[in-house]
Amino acid sequence: MAAGTAVGAWVLVLSLWGAVVGAQNITARIGEPLVLKCKGAPKKPPQRLEWKLNTGRTEAWKVLSPQGGGPWDSVARVLPNGSLFLPAVGIQDEGIFRCQAMNRNGKETKSNYRVRVYQIPGKPEIVDSASELTAGVPNKVGTCVSEGSYPAGTLSWHLDGKPLVPNEKGVSVKEQTRRHPETGLFTLQSELMVTPARGGDPRPTFSCSFSPGLPRHRALRTAPIQPRVWEPVPLEEVQLVVEPEGGAVAPGGTVTLTCEVPAQPSPQIHWMKDGVPLPLPPSPVLILPEIGPQDQGTYSCVATHSSHGPQESRAVSISIIEPGEEGPTAGSVGGSGLGTLALALGILGGLGTAALLIGVILWQRRQRRGEERKAPENQEEEEERAELNQSEEPEAGESSTGGP
């Protein structure tokens, strides 16, 4: 009994699944006529067929017969050949349409359609567009509007032809979707905000496109807009000059750091050491007299302009070199000094000598062993072996030219 119920339930599920899966997808444009064929129906009456509809206009399944008549005729009627005719498809006509027909021989044929409707909106437009944008701050570029779409679809923005991703690199988008109370068509609005980079493109090109909700329909793009990017104040490079060059100084020596800003007026200059502000009054020059280990570190200056935010210079490294050592080259970060280099070379030299000695001893042993085993067959062979041994020798001694 339970097994029978289970089988029955499965048959029901599968039949419903089959009904959906086996359906032929039809897309129809709103306002246009639609003809759905009833397969297997005799071409002329008398016909044994019926259409079943489950759409936005029906409570559940609505049955239509070839006899027709009544208010439904204005929405859908069965044609003499058995096809179902909808004179002007509307949003409420989305749904399932089924036909069951029996031919003269009593063979039953079923047709199953899944109808979706669409409406392509007018070309989208950018309204309320800005002719100028301020660099470094968020600006409203404009609002893209698409009217009269079904399904809703989506709006997307492009910069110089490439898609703009919201919440990335100062890009934000505010979207709004409204549905017309009578037509049921959608109006989409998308407001674009961007923060143009200082020193970026002075004439960026923005456009907006509408992508339909149903596939196989191409996107519609607006005419592009090209606002100018305005930078209220010059973006000047903050230069940090170090004396002595390279920032390496002997203990007790003096380092002079100068912060050069070409901007007008002269901004306030603050100093940083290892990323921490130094508690000093603003000054374009920082003098470090009688350098000690505590003064070693990475220095930079920050210029604060009255008309725009702070700008930091490149960082320079200040290091102490022992007397007799040569400072690192300009721009290098600190110096290990020649002392360390000499030590490293000494160690390498020692290792090299040891390797050379071991190589020589092993070679001599091999030579002796070879002589004991057998004398060379001819002069050529002996020369060849000598050559081979010679080429091995320098490798063992770190390419040194001298013999043992």
Partner: nanobody, 120 residues
């Protein structure tokens, strides 16, 4: 090339107002981003306010925000600086400047300046 002539400076009591004008002649005025700068005795020239090509965008130095207003009339080739609630520290020679750089931020053309004196 553009020529700039400032006017409207003078002596005013603290708390008073002045309106500076800068008339431009030469090339198309709307191609230039405009700015006002000032230089007090013994000090560096400092930025005051700037306005974009169309006049839609403006920018001020912190010390004048809420008191000064920059505007422009492209039909009259003129840029204005309305100065309200003037303070003695606003005393300076005020210069008008024009920029035809891509971003409108490098000032290539300067006027001769107009003196503004605010007495306490």
């Amino acid at each position: 090339e553009v020529q700039l002539v400032e006017s409207g400076g003078g002596l005013v009591q603290a708390g008073g107002s002045l309106r500076l004008s800068c008339a431009a002649s030469g090339r198309t005025f709307s191609n230039y981003s405009m700015g006002w700068f000032r230089q007090a005795p013994g000090k560096e020239r400092e930025f005051v306010a700037t306005i974009s090509w169309s006049g839609a965008l403006t920018h001020y130095t912190d010390s004048v925000k809420g008191r000064f207003t920059i505007s422009r009339d492209n039909a009259k080739n003129t840029v204005y600086l309305q100065m309200n609630s003037l303070k003695p520290e606003d005393t300076a020679v005020y210069y008008c400047a024009a920029s035809d750089s891509d971003y409108g931020n490098k000032y290539d053309y300067w006027g001769q300046g107009t003196q503004v004196t605010v007495s306490s």
